[in-house]
Each structure stands twice: as C-alpha cells, then as structure tokens.
Amino acid sequence: SGVFQLQLQEFINERGVLASGRPCEPGCRTFFRVCLKHFQAVVSPGPCTFGTVSTPVLGTNSFAVRDDSSGGGRNPLQLPFNFTWPGTFSLIIEAWHAPGDDLRPEALPPDALISKIAIQGSLAVGQNWLLDEQTSTLTRLRYSYRVICSDNYYGDNCSRLCKKRNDHFGHYVCQPDGNLSCLPGWTGEYCQQPICLSGCHEQNGYCSKPAECLCRPGWQGRLCNECIPHNGCRHGTCSTPWQCTCDEGWGGLFCDQDLNYCTHHSPCKNGATCSNSGQRSYTCTCRPGYTGVDCELELSECDSNPCRNGGSCKDQEDGYHCLCPPGYYGLHCEHSTLSCADSPCFNGGSCRERNQGANYACECPPNFTGSNCEKKVDRCTSNPCANGGQCLNRGPSRMCRCRPGFTGTYCELHVSDCARNPCAHGGTCHDLENGLMCTCPAGFSGRRCEVRTSIDACASSPCFNRATCYTDLSTDTFVCNCPYGFVGSRCEFPVGLPPSFPW
C-alpha cells in the first residue's frame, strides 16, 4: 500500500490557445486530469488501473502552482494504491480549459483540451522527487513525482506491513525496511520476550518483564543461581534443588545427626582424649589419676589399699606413702621383724612359724585378710563387676561403676541400644551383643536407615521440551522446570505456535 504523488510546478501557455489552435475567451482557465496506470510500451487509452485524480482550476494561460501540501491542499496530487508497487507505471496528464464552473467531462465542450502528455517508465519507492518537463508546440508543463509507502507499510514495494506496538503481543518500532526493532529490554521474533535481569540464570530464572529475575521451583537468590536445600536440612548444603549434602561431622537425611560429638561438645574432662564412636556417642581415654565416663573423677592411689600388715596409706602428689606399724618395713610394709612370740596375727588369726622361727605366716578367719589378718576382706578383690565395670570400695559396702551400655548392681545387665529408637524412617531395631542392627523399610538404607534410596521420579523422563526434571524427595514426585515459552506440569504446552504450524 502506498501513494503516487504528482507535484505540478509550472504551466506555460503564452498564447492562451487550445490544442485545436482556437484561443480561449477571455483566457484559458486551466485545470488538470491525471491518469495513472500499469506500464504500457505505448501508452494508449483505457482504464486508469492505478487511479485518477482531477484538480480545480489552478490558473489562466501561464502560471506557477503553489506547493499546498502543508496547508492540506491538493498539490502534490495524491494517487493512493492498495497493492504491491510494481516498479513501473504509465502516466497521462491532460490540461483542460473550463469555460464555466462545472468541470465534469460531460459538461465540457469537446475541444476544451489544451494539451496532453503521456510518459512511462520505472520508478522505485523513495523520498526523492523526479523532476520532469514536457513541451509541445504551444505549451510547456514542469512537474515532479515520486512513490512513497502509506503509514505502516515498508520495503522496496510497500508490501511489508509493520505497525509499531508496545503491548502483550510485541514491544517494537519499525525499521525503514519494515523489519522490527525491539524496544529496550525486549527480544525475540516479535519482541515478546523480555530480557531478564543481567546475570539471571538461563535455566533456573525467567521474567515476565525486562530486568526482572523470577526463580523457578527449587531456586532462590537475586539471580536464581542458589539452590533451595531439602526442607528441614539443618547442617547441609545443596548443588541441585531439594538436596541435603551434609557438612563434615553431620549425618542423616536432614544432616541433623551429630557424628562429631567430640568437636561439637568437648565432653572429656581433665585433659582426656575424646574419640567419636557413632551418632551422639563418644569414649574418653583418661590421663593417669582420673576415672569416670568423662574422666571427671580424680583417682586416689590409696583406693587399692597397697599398704600391707596394717600400714596406713597417705596420698601424695606423685603417688602414695605407707606408714608401717611397729615390726614392719618396706615400700608396702611387706617385711616383718616379728615372730609368733610377738602375737602378730590380729582378728583371731593363728600364727605358724617358718624357717626355724625366722618368720611366720598368719592363717586368717573368714572376712579378714592381709599378712597379719589386719584387713577386712576387700569386696573388690574378687572383681565382682562384670563387663569391665570398675569396683569402688565405699566403707562396708562396694559399688560398681559401669561402662556405657551396661547397668545393674554388678554391671551384669546390657542396656538396650534400641531404647533410644536409633533407626530412622520406621526401621526395626535389633539388639546385638556388641551393638545394634537396623532393618530398614523399602526406600531407605544405611546403618540407621538414614539414607533415602527411593525410586527416581525423573527416571521415566516425564518432562518435555528440554525441561529440567527434579525429584521432590519429600513426596517422591517430579517437578519440571520449563524453558521459556512452555508451560504445564510437564512443560507440554507451547505458549505460542508459528503461523506455519501444520494444523
């Protein structure tokens, strides 16, 4: 679609005569008829296939024609067309004399024609005017012409329609050749696709307007480049959404099980060495002189009653010292200077001489012991504490301090490792002699059933159109992360289909 424009500039008819040679009375009141048609090698009469236009009376005999385009007038003359400009044309311009005010062909005398010119040729679409002058024996016509495209039409033949827009269907202006030029912030064939915030992750982010960055499920951050870990993940991170990869020292599905109790809690006292031995479990190795589960108890070296023959024990910083009764000597008062004549046996013990009276031996009644029957029987000597329990004399009684995992008066009872429900996700716990064992339900594994081994919901490739599939660990279902231009739970719907789509 376009317009053929004809600008009449000057008409000369000095003698004021008609084509027949007859003079006009009182002068030639001149108007023009224009016929535009398809190219003809020899321009002949017939339909004006591209259009016609007539002017009012523009002057008498010789006159210049004012450019009237700015004032909404009729110069240049407009010949609009609604087809692809073919690049060639034929043009007929007739100058007529109007004796009266009626310019209709049928109202004019047959010899009212002043002059007639016919031209033909090639004409490309463009802004530049082509200047021409045609002379006959009596007249001269100077004019210029051009072809320009109508509003919203572009290209060499005015065949390309382009209407600038800034709405849901596109955001663009039109280039001189009719191609689209996207407005800032938009891209794509029809400039419908917003340019997201610079750096917005190509797969994990998207936008509905320019400079925006909206995150797809499982992603977060200004540029949607940070994954969201599994809900409830305590001491872990992710590299893809819904993961929970545990930090060092933590375990379990949610990384909430402490595997490094020693570092996190420092339970061992008095310079003891701590060793991790499982979830929330540890062992303290005490320095000499300390005992207890956490090495919190100071050990007295006199507790083992090292002094013999009634010697009394004194604790010292670097050990102990025995104070021997009369007649005894040695580190533990183990050497005697007595004989049976000195009645050395206490608590009803009977004395037997040895080595021709050089020394003796006491035979003690029940409940007494020692080389002189001076000691009550130490209830710990028979090592009554089972399972590695530590025996402690407490006056007339004794007690057993049990190792972790044992209880009872003599540490004879095995504490059930299953009592604290160590098996995750409904695993069944079995007590064993040296620990426990978990039998895991389907979908879980690991020493404590803490590892999820459920089926991969993405294995069946449920997502279409190059979408990324993620498994939601909490529901064992898939989540499809759609690329731009596709929607639906499986990214199965394109938001637009090209006009050439084979319906």
């Epitope: 069946s460 739970s489 199965e492 719907f493």
Partner: nanobody
Framework: EVQLVESGGGLVQAGGSLRLSCAAS????????MGWYRHQAPGKQRELVA????????HYADSVKGRFTISRDNAKNTMYLQMNSLKPEDTAVYYC?????????????WGQGTQVTVSS
C-alpha cells in the same frame, strides 16, 4: 485416535460472557492434558489462552488472567473455557487441543475451531 468437538462460540458484545466446550472421545480422558489456543489473524501465531495439565494444575496467558477460567469434567469427557468481561481483542478462532501421554512422548490432537467475535 482422539476426536475433539468445540462448541459455544458466537457473537457477543464487549463486556459479555461466553462458555466454550470441548468434548473428547477416549476412555482415559482424565489423564489427558488439555488447552485452549486462539488464532487472531492470518500470519499471526496461534497463542495459548489457557491449559489444564493431567494433574489438574492450570495456566493462563497474562492477557486473560482473572477473566477466563478453564475447567474439566472427567465424567463427561469435556473441557470448558468460561470467558467473562470479553474485549474486542479476544476476537479469534478458538481451538481445543489435547495431549495424550506415552512413557516419554505425547500425541497432539486439535479440534476444528469455533469463532468468537466480540463487538464494541
């Protein structure tokens, strides 16, 4: 092979309402993903108006959000598009589309289309 038949199109004044229906053949209708596309002019792309996936999740084009509602009745093997507050720019041929799924593929089926004309 799935057959789709649309109905409910017609001429309506701006601000008025229409309800489009799409009846589908096939015994596994509830597992189909279904959508409405529209074609507004020759040479323009066919544009997704609304879609409902087999899991029931819905999606709408920005231009119709809040005005159009997509739904399905699995017992009647029919999908609907309730169109309220219609505008002249909603004038188009509306096509019903369904997708039937295999293990990792789907087949596309289209109806013949129903004309909706909104006059101002």
């Amino acid at each position: 092979e799935v057959q789709l038949v649309e109905s409910g199109g017609g001429l309506v004044q701006a601000g008025g309402s229409l309800r489009l229906s799409c009846a589908a053949s096939g015994s596994t209708f509830s597992s189909y993903a279904m959508g409405w596309y529209r074609h507004q002019a020759p040479g323009k792309q066919r544009e997704l108006v609304a879609a409902i996936s087999s899991d029931g999740s819905t999606h709408y084009a920005d231009s119709v959000k809040g005005r159009f509602t997509i739904s399905r009745d699995n017992a009647k093997n029919t999908m609907y598009l309730q169109m309220n507050s219609l505008k002249p720019e909603d004038t188009a041929v509306y096509y019903c589309n369904t997708k039937t799924f295999g293990s990792n593929w789907y087949d596309d089926y289209w109806g013949q289309g129903t004309q909706v004309t909104v006059s101002s």
